[in-house]
Interface confidence: medium
């Protein structure tokens, strides 16, 4: 298991919510990405190859998410101070072998200007 801080901008704020960006290498074909808040699993997304060109995307702990060819974005809404915490992207790579797990993360700071529905 590889641990480290994200070397990219992991948190993108908009409209009182936050997009948490979890990147993976674009050679990865099949994987599971979990979003952890502290040690708690908030969200997950699994991408697997299927018959022919088919692909299966499944979530056991569903969050609004967006998949690209090198990242999964998880969206958290209605931010408040309780959202401030360490968040980790826990990537399990199934394909290409060998099986590997990487953990990257950072601290989500919540400032008044980022909270939902603040009067400007």
């Amino acid at each position: 298991e590889i641990n480290g801080s994200a070397n990219y901008e992991m948190f993108i704020f908009h409209n009182g919510g936050v997009q948490i960006l979890c990147k993976y290498p674009d050679i990865v074909q099949q994987f599971k990405m979990q979003l952890l808040k502290g040690g708690q699993i908030l969200c997950d997304l699994t991408k697997t190859k299927g018959s022919g060109n088919t692909v299966s995307i499944k979530s056991l702990k569903f969050c609004h998410s967006q998949l690209s060819n090198n990242s999964v974005s998880f969206f958290l809404y209605n931010l408040d101070h309780s959202h401030a915490n360490y968040y980790f992207c826990n990537l399990s790579i199934f394909d290409p072998p060998p099986f590997k797990v990487t953990l990257t993360g950072g601290y989500l700071h919540i400032y008044e200007s980022q909270l939902c529905c603040q009067l400007k």
């Epitope: 074909q29 099949q30 599971k32 699994t46 697997t48 190859k49 299927g50 018959s51 022919g52 060109n53 088919t54 692909v55 299966s56 499944k58 399990s92 199934f94 394909d95 290409p96 072998p97 099986f99």
Partner: antibody
Amino acid sequence: EVQLVESGGGVVRPGGSLRLSCVASGVTFDDYGMSWVRQAPGKGLEWVSGINWNGGDTDYSDSVKGRFTISRDNAKNSLYLQMNSLRAEDTALYYCARDFYGSGSYYHVPFDYWGQGILVTVSS
Amino acid sequence: EIVLTQSPGTLSLSPGERATLSCRASQSVSRSYLAWYQQKRGQAPRLLIYGASSRATGIPDRFSGDGSGTDFTLSISRLEPEDFAVYYCHQYDMSPFTFGPGTKVDIK
């Protein structure tokens, strides 16, 4: 024990239609992609079509594209193959087969479980 | 599409002998997405090997797979009477998935 049982085969004239069904038991059906594979009499195996776990993604071999439609109903643990504009060369034993995810990971492998096959004969 | 060629077409051997079956792909099968199936007369195919070399659940260790890229082999170390059948290789890397024409292993 996983069981896949096909039905709906028979004799049909060229240009006609058939709908094959495959019912799965002993498995959490919506955990898996599924495929149809066929075998002409005395010949080898040919992959026909595949579908992902929720029916949102499908794929076809060039030989059936535009004529066959794969679908599934997870509530009924069922896989289907609607076959239109049938030709003599579609005559075969049709198997449904389950996609498999290997040893503790999601490393993809077709096909670990197969039905017993259902015969489709296209003849005038 | 990836065309798979198997050789020999027929292999005549006695029980206890070693069988070596070959499968060649017309282009590289990346990530070793190659499987082997056994089919006996009147039965559905049975998965033996996936990922070129991983044995499927319940498959005896006399079956082994090897190879990468375009050249793959299935070996049966000591043929048992129940091993006489047709063997197909299968690539599941690129759509359309394709199968080889098969190698028949029969009793000499």
